[in-house]
């Protein structure tokens, strides 16, 4: 029997190294069968995930997945941190893995480092 559970496909331990001042779209891939669940984004503050209110979000569809997108227009240094999406389905809450945004403030770097440089130079990242 084919599974009809809601699934959220944010990859475990995923991260995105991005630059302040750029636009960025954070994708939450959602699989559902009949009715699209209500999906929200939150940002982790310690062990609590604080729901993001009043942010620009949108949906896109490809094949059998829908993508609930959180828009950063533009990315701010304060956007650094870990995010999670969650779906409200049949009165149950399904939570995704968290995904981390590492924001580099381009004002503090004379030129943009590469992704590989950023991975090996954590002092460039906001903690």
């Amino acid at each position: 029997k084919e599974s009809c559970d809601v699934q959220l496909y944010i990859k475990r331990q995923s991260y995105h190294s991005i630059f302040a001042g750029d636009p960025f779209k954070l994708e939450c891939p959602v699989k559902y069968c009949a009715h699209r669940p209500q999906v929200t984004w939150c940002k982790l503050n310690g062990t609590t995930c604080v729901k993001l209110e009043g942010r620009h979000t949108s949906w896109k569809q490809e094949k059998n997945l829908s993508f609930f997108i959180l828009h950063f227009e533009p990315v701010l240094p304060s956007d650094n941190g870990s995010y999670r999406c969650s779906a409200n389905f049949l009165s149950a809450i399904i939570e995704s893995h968290s995904t981390t945004l590492y924001v580099t403030d381009v004002k503090s770097a004379s030129e943009r480092p590469s992704k590989d440089e950023m991975a090996s130079r954590p002092w460039l990242l906001y903690s």
């Epitope: 496909y9 475990r12 991260y15 995105h16 190294s17 699989k31 490809e62 992704k115």
Partner: antibody, heavy 116, light 106 residues
Framework: QVQLQESGPGLVKPSETLSLTCTVS????????WSWIRQPPGKGLEWIGY???????NYNPSLKSRVTISADTSKNQFSLKLSSVTAADTAVYYC??????????WGQGTTVTVSS | AIQLTQSPSSLSASVGDRVTITCRAS??????LAWYQQKPGKAPKLLIY???SLESGVPSRFSGSGSGTDFTLTISSLQPEDFATYYC????????FGGGTKVEIK
């Protein structure tokens, strides 16, 4: 629909760097994840690594010290570099779209032989 | 990294047979497992995702089941075009593939 095409030299000398490019048509690499997989002659599939829509990467731990995957969004391409190759790196190399739950679109594969 | 062990490594079957291939993960992966079919000289083709969901365009004679560590791919009635090698694949942080099962004509 999305299509992928690998390109690059079919013959690489030992100790040199293998470089391959995957050109994506019918879709944008600014969404999803994009993987490289290889298959040595007569053997099974081995995941090499992926690059995300933001450019972040994740590599197979057994190959991590030798692998770099990068993307050029202006050309809608992503690339693989594998350094210090040996005969054990002889394989068919595939690029694929990682559609979160599995690799749903693959290139046709390109054979790379490591030999002097 | 999570290891996937497929069995059998090869099998012989006839057209119309019911074929079952198993895949065991070295640790629990929930339903994060896919199955592929590969024919000689061709790229793999996604058949099943989320352990039991049929990829679009794949015939309904293919089905998947399982969760946690033990998974099964079943072909309910083997067709001539189904003779191929089948791989399981877990898509955790470090994706891995099973060793493959070659389905041959008896």
């Amino acid at each position: 629909q999305v299509q992928l095409q690998e390109s690059g030299p079919g013959l690489v000398k030992p100790s040199e760097t293998l470089s391959l490019t995957c050109t994506v048509s019918g879709g944008s690499i600014s969404s999803y994840y994009w993987s490289w997989i290889r298959q040595p002659p007569g053997k099974g599939l081995e995941w090499i690594g992926y690059i995300s829509y933001s450019g972040s990467t994740n590599y197979n731990p057994s190959l991590k010290s030798r692998v770099t995957i990068s993307a050029d969004t202006s050309k809608n391409q992503f690339s693989l570099k594998l350094s210090s190759v040996t005969a054990a790196d002889t394989a068919v190399y595939y690029c694929a779209r990682d559609f979160y739950y599995g690799m749903d679109v693959w290139g046709q594969g390109t054979t790379v032989t490591v030999s002097s | 990294a999570i290891q996937l062990t497929q069995s059998p490594s090869s099998l012989s079957a006839s057209v119309g047979d019911r074929v079952t291939i198993t895949c065991r993960a070295s640790q629990g992966i929930s339903s994060a497992l896919a199955w592929y079919q590969q024919k000689p000289g061709k790229a793999p083709k996604l058949l099943i995702y989320d352990a039991s969901s049929l990829e679009s365009g794949v015939p309904s004679r293919f089905s998947g089941s399982g969760s946690g560590t033990d998974f099964t791919l079943t072909i309910s009635s083997l067709q001539p075009e189904d003779f191929a090698t089948y791989y399981c694949h877990q898509f955790d942080y470090y994706p891995t593939f099973g060793g493959g099962t070659k389905v041959e004509i008896k």
